[in-house]
Amino acid sequence: HTTVDTSGLLQHVKFQSSNFENILTWDGGPASTSDTVYSVEYKKYGERKWLAKAGCQRITQKFCNLTMETRNHTEFYYAKVTAVSAGGPPVTKMTDRFSSLQHTTIKPPDVTCIPKVRSIQMLVHPTLTPVLSEDGHQLTLEEIFHDLFYRLELHVNHTYQMHLEGKQREYEFLGLTPDTEFLGSITILTPILSKESAPYVCRVKTLPDRTWAYS
């Protein structure tokens, strides 16, 4: 969703979306200077009127947070940036049509890895998004993507891995050796929209077996 550059003042106007946080970004072209200022407008697909984004008028930074303005994940949106440099005409560039549902990327999950003597427990914490339900609750990724599941891997050594997959939030790798270091990785996947997060990685060591001390 990047526009083609036909000017030296403004280029690469695009949405960058992660976990439904939708940031409009752009680059100044070779003709832009330190006094170039930018103004942002946005609209819902199908509407004619452009709306000015408060807080993103005549700014010098090259990004603008449009999360609240584009928070309906079932809708399509456009945004445009107008660049003005001293003594020159304004240049406007528009994004491609943007859908947060289609275009957002998924961040690694938040996971707690808990070592035990012969097992490692992994607790996945729900990922909150800025998307709101009708009653004003922030929705989790699990409440938006029916097909979302977690892929867990435990690297036992260079040649052997254990795998678990599921829609649960609690997992346990069993039958491990005490007092041994393991590398865990947990990824979020949503098959229908072909999304896959980078993995959350934890390095944990199983607890030493103290039972011999009591025998």
């Epitope: 599941f149 678990l164 599921g166 649960q168």
Partner: antibody, heavy 117, light 107 residues
Amino acid sequence: EVQLVESGGGLVQPGGSLRLSCAASGFTFSSSWMYWVRQAPGKGLEFVSVINTRSGITHYVESVKGRFTISTDNAKNTLFLQMNSLKSEDTAVYYCATRIQGLIDYWGQGTQVTVSS
Amino acid sequence: DIQMTQSPSSLSASLGDRVTITCQASQSISSMLAWYQQKPGQAPNLLIYGASRLQTGVPSRFSGSRSGTSFTLTISGVEAEDLATYYCLQDYSWPLTFGQGTKVELK
């Protein structure tokens, strides 16, 4: 204890309508995925529709799109299936089910829907 | 839609027999497969999830395994209470789809 109790089934003529209900208790209804699953006489199981009770996101199997509507009343912990333009092939036992802790492990006892003239 | 091809459609077993039921997915579904048992007039009952994990309270004679897109349910020693119809379910993407079912009867 999780409980799901369906009601609203019955005999209806082709082209007619029915509204199924599923009263839920024993879990957090207002933040769950709820399903309607059906089983035609002597046949296998088929997922019909799903709704997330918080986000309101819905999905339907192709054969019922435009005819069936899934909805909830979160204040009353109730799931609904509005079935319009019913066909003989919609004759089945309709179960509601829910996903708890990632697993579709709780089902109602089912309600019979018969579409016949 | 993902098709789940289940075989056999029925089988006859003697008590104590080892029984194997197979499901083949039409595409990759990772390990997102569950097995259910259904008795006449009852709702399905979850046995196995994640292709191989035993649901709490299910007897250990039930086990599941995966090889690529092929999944197997094994009953290591059939008991009278196991006579029922068994379904696999892919929980990978909507619409969730069941296999056609396998009816386990007494020989």
